[in-house]
Interface confidence: low
Amino acid sequence: QFLKEGQLAAGTCEVIAAHRDSSQPRRTIARQTARCACRKGQIAGTTRARPACVDARIIKTKQWCDMLPCLEGEGCDLLINRSGWTCTQPGGRIKTTTVS
């Protein structure tokens, strides 16, 4: 059946707000607010650089790269102490995401 307006399909997320904080020199912090309807055993995370429902085990174990958080063609590496991950683009540019 079709979903009612504003209703999310199980296991999906939608971005409801996004803004950039450029107040810190040399660093841009992008924040997205997402609404997720995750199934049992899932939790809101990031897949292919988009909000997504991911296996809750990933969050517990902090194996962030198992979410496939980076875009296709990018390489993912865990930060020291598993505080987040980096996505390395083919050209070598690195994007770092920390989990607060």
């Epitope: 296996d55 990933i58 496939l68």
Partner: antibody
Framework: QEQLVESGGRLVTPGTPLTLSCTAS????????MSWVRQAPGKGLEWIGI?????STDYASWAKGRFTISKTSTTVDLKITTPTTEDTATYFC?????????????????WGPGTLVTVSL | ELVMTQTPPSLSASVGETVRIRCLAS??????ISWYQQKPGKPPTLLIY???NLESGVPPRFSGSGSGSDYTLTIGGVQAEDAATYYC??????????????FGAGTNVEIK
């Protein structure tokens, strides 16, 4: 109800390129990974390849160069670049679902009814 | 390249019996396996994903188990309507290598 329908299957002569299309109802193709699978008469299923929301693709090793998967805003297309008699089969498009475990564990949750391609002289 | 070896190719069972179909992957696929039922002239339908998760609407007599490279589909108390061909699909997507999926050769289940 979420559905897929393939079209474009017909009788072609060897070497004549053919493009199949897959359209969706009940959901938007653009947000999903989509795959093509084929089945020769009386044989098993063969995975051909996958297209991601970004438009990038992965193919089975045997399918590289023989098939091209692309998409528009409303369809996912499969081009059989140089058909041979061995490409005679029913071609299915399938929506890829998945969840994140050790990798993105993929499976097909919705299939089209298939479209028959016959390659013959 | 991933190879999925599915056994047996065919089997015959009586109503109420337990049927088991095995798929052996050529490498560890970390539960990245799904199972499908196909009846003649129809597309496949999803039964099990992630090795052991039952798809919505599928009768609970179907179950999946296994880990590493060895997986099994079990039909407990097989019914006449379960006569069909069953396929496994193995593969996992990694950001580094992309997606590579392989079907097993199929198992034709006949109900006596």
């Amino acid at each position: 109800q979420e559905q897929l329908v393939e079209s474009g299957g017909r009788l072609v002569t060897p070497g004549t390129p053919l493009t199949l299309s897959c359209t969706a109802s009940g959901f938007f193709l653009s947000g999903y990974y989509m795959s093509w699978v084929r089945q020769a008469p009386g044989k098993g299923l063969e995975w051909i390849g996958i297209i991601y929301p970004s438009g990038s693709t992965d193919y089975a090793s045997w399918a590289k160069g023989r098939f091209t998967i692309s998409k528009t805003s409303t369809t996912v297309d499969l081009k059989i670049t140089t058909p041979t008699t061995e490409d005679t089969a029913t071609y299915f498009c399938a929506r890829v679902a998945g969840y994140v475990g050790y990798g993105y564990e993929t499976f097909f949750d919705i299939w089209g009814p298939g479209t028959l391609v016959t390659v013959s002289l | 390249e991933l190879v999925m070896t599915q056994t047996p190719p065919s089997l015959s069972a009586s109503v109420g019996e337990t049927v088991r179909i095995r798929c052996l992957a050529s490498e560890d696929i970390y539960s990245g396996i799904s199972w499908y039922q196909q009846k003649p002239g129809k597309p496949p339908t999803l039964l099990i994903y992630g090795a052991s998760n039952l798809e919505s609407g599928v009768p609970p007599r179907f179950s999946g188990s296994g880990s590493g490279s060895d997986y099994t589909l079990t039909i407990g108390g097989v019914q006449a309507e379960d006569a069909a061909t069953y396929y496994c699909l193995g593969g996992v997507t990694y950001s580094s290598t992309g997606t590579h999926l392989t079907f097993g050769a199929g198992t034709n289940v006949e109900i006596k």
